[in-house]
């Protein structure tokens, strides 16, 4: 058993049929010694008396808010949550496995630049009685500060018969050094509580590996005289790190016909313009990637050929 | 060329070669199917590699003030990785294929380090750790970790030379 926060405790349980459970001793936070009784949740059934209460925690029915009283007055509360371990593996029932980039990916994180600011998100099908708490640091043995805001519900989607909820959080490294080569990964820890179930999820990454630039901006076409060719031009996204002579991007320009089956023409360039042939009913798209480190490509910015 | 006395390197040549290094480092390190490198105890193998850190003057401001600190750190790293790629970790079993990008990477590391430091000048270099795993699979794992950290190192070096070529070239 360990304390998650004031008056909230997590009981770690090996979860299998007929498991013995954990013996837990609760102590009433009061100078009083006599006439103390204990109840669980809204029930008025007295579970025991005295300053301490010893219980055997085996299942969710044994978890909940234990309250000690004296003469009708509440003295203190202890909320017990359960953390299940099945076959040596902690349960991951609350969050959905996003399976990208690999199985057992519950948290996904992205950064738009090297400033030390990043966003993480996760998915769940649970809509109520759900709380999240996020902590983060750079390195684990001698951790350096990363400040995270509160996790918020950022999207709702319908997937088949199920509703899926996306939560996200923004974090900022306290003293980021954008030009340095990271040697210690960022660690992100999410505590998730659904009703009386506790779970924790972690992710470890370097900012460089989660970089995904915003799409190029101001995408424009300029027809070239007496030719089917056009000059495509664009600019670095505003959110990308500066100066651009140091934090450089590379670009992919794609000409795509109306039909998905039509052959795509692609050009790769380090410049912010390119000359391509504009086919009728086609569209031109451009996306960006860090020039020197192969992290994610941005989403496409597109304009129609016409 | 960057020499301890402080003259300027051939920024444009360094830029081209460092960008080639980035491409080669990514060709040489495919995503590893069944090895999750972070779970395989990175600390003992990659703590010893030279990293370009915050105080090394490799940021745009630091380069403008005095690029020598940064160039020395990059040179140190290039020599370190060049030695690693020429060591038993990479020459042992499983053998490199004749046209492996690793071979070209090794040659390019040497090329860039020589551009930064002509014969006769000596910057201090770091000892390479004596890592010589006996099993091929351990060697393979170590190769992936080294290439992974090399990708990060050459990315910073390439940014430095690109910025230098754009803003510091005579």
């Amino acid at each position: 058993i360990w304390e998650l926060k004031k008056d909230v405790y997590v009981v770690e349980l090996d979860w299998y049929p007929d498991a013995p459970g954990e013996m837990v001793v609760l102590t009433c936070d009061t100078p009083e010694e006599d006439g103390i009784t204990w109840t669980l949740d809204q029930s008025s059934e007295v579970l025991g008396s005295g300053k301490t209460l010893t219980i055997q925690v085996k299942e969710f029915g044994d978890a909940g808010q234990y309250t000690c009283h004296k003469g009708g007055e509440v003295l203190s509360h202890s909320l017990l949550l359960l953390h299940k371990k099945e076959d040596g593996i902690w349960s991951t029932d609350i969050l959905k496995d996003q399976k990208e980039p690999k199985n057992k990916t519950f948290l996904r994180c992205e950064a738009k630049n090297y400033s030390g600011r990043f966003t993480c998100w996760w998915l769940t099908t649970i809509s109520t009685d759900l709380t999240f708490s996020v902590k983060s640091s750079r390195g684990s043995s001698d951790p350096q500060g990363v400040t995270c805001g509160a996790a918020t519900l950022s999207a709702e989607r319908v997937r088949g018969d199920n509703k899926e909820y996306e939560y996200s959080v923004e974090c900022q490294e306290d003293s980021a050094c954008p030009a340095a080569e990271e040697s210690l990964p960022i660690e992100v820890m999410v505590d998730a509580v659904h009703k009386l179930k506790y779970e924790n999820y972690t992710s470890s990454f370097f900012i460089r590996d989660i970089i995904k630039p915003d799409p190029p901006k101001n995408l424009q076409l300029k027809p070239l005289k007496n030719s089917r060719q056009v000059e495509v031009s664009w600019e670095y996204p505003d959110t990308w790190s500066t100066p651009h002579s140091y934090f450089s991007l590379t670009f992919c320009v794609q000409v795509q016909g109306k039909s998905k089956r039509e052959k795509k023409d692609r050009v790769f360039t380090d410049k912010t313009s390119a000359t391509v042939i504009c086919r009728k009913n086609a569209s031109i798209s451009v996306r960006a990637q860090d020039r020197y480190y192969s992290s994610s490509w941005s989403e496409w910015a597109s304009v129609p050929c016409s | 060329r960057a020499v301890p006395g402080g003259s300027s390197p051939a920024w444009t040549q360094c830029q081209q070669l460092s960008q080639k290094l980035c491409t080669l480092a990514w060709s040489a390190h495919p995503l590893v199917g069944h090895m999750d490198l972070r779970e395989e105890g990175d600390e003992e193998t990659t703590n010893d590699v030279p990293h370009i850190q915050c105080g090394d003057g490799c940021d745009p401001q630091g380069l403008r003030d005095n690029s020598q600190f940064c160039l020395q750190r990059i040179h140190q790293g290039l020599i370190f990785y060049e030695k690693l790629l020429g060591s038993d970790i990479f020459t042992g079993e499983p053998s490199l294929l004749p046209d492996s990008p690793v071979g070209q990477l090794h040659a390019s590391l040497l090329g860039l380090s020589q551009l930064l430091q002509p014969e006769g000048h000596h910057w201090e270099t770091q000892q390479i750790p004596s890592l010589s795993p006996s099993q091929p699979w351990q060697r393979l794992l170590l190769r992936f970790k080294i290439l992974r950290s090399l990708q990060a190192f050459v990315a910073v070096a390439a940014r430095v030379f690109a910025h230098g070529a754009a803003t510091l070239s005579p």
Epitope: - | S27, H29, P30, P94, L96, L97, R143
Partner: antibody
Framework: QVHLVQSGAEVKKPGASVKVSCKAS????????INWVRQAPGQGLEWMGW????????DYSQHLQGRVTMTTDTSTNTAYMELRSLRSDDTAVYYC?????????????WGQGTLVTVSS | EIVLTQSPDFQSVTPKEKVTITCRAS??????LHWYQQKPDQSPKLLIT???QSFSGVPSRFSGSGSGTDFTLTIHSLEAEDAATYYC?????????FGQGTKLEIK
Amino acid sequence: QVHLVQSGAEVKKPGASVKVSCKASGYTFSSYGINWVRQAPGQGLEWMGWISAYSGNTDYSQHLQGRVTMTTDTSTNTAYMELRSLRSDDTAVYYCARASANWYDYFDPWGQGTLVTVSS
Amino acid sequence: EIVLTQSPDFQSVTPKEKVTITCRASQTIGGSLHWYQQKPDQSPKLLITYASQSFSGVPSRFSGSGSGTDFTLTIHSLEAEDAATYYCHQSSILPYTFGQGTKLEIK
């Protein structure tokens, strides 16, 4: 998820040629090599050759030299194996399998196989 | 070229039995030997890499050992689904070669 998907079964006459394709997905194609392995009915595995998708360099089994050509198309992440002057003993299931483009390595994953039948 | 010789060629075994398949190389190949399992009408599947390393997702009953010229694949407690042909493969020197295969039948 890494996948190699091969083209469908072929029936050829002796003396003809066959070209089998192997489309890769789920990984950086140019950072690996593709091996071709064949298996005659009821027999074991026979390595035919290897191509680096990084450099295009090839190595062929000595006794197929001159009859086999391996190529890659990095724009479509596809590897091809062409076998010419087919004989009846070329009847086999042909597999493509991924290995490193850096060092001598194991094969994983394998394509589903393409049955080539050579019969007059 | 390096010749890999497996033994036995065929083995009929009962579930829960321990099975040992050996692979001998005609010259030293260090640790560059891999094992594959092939079930009827399926592609080969990688089991063990570099003589002793279990590949991802492979049941723990499969293990490998050996180096130099003599290698062993062990199935510690055979299950019905292990009925297949097992091949060793060397990646030490081109041309890559395979053993002739060992067919395991479940009694």
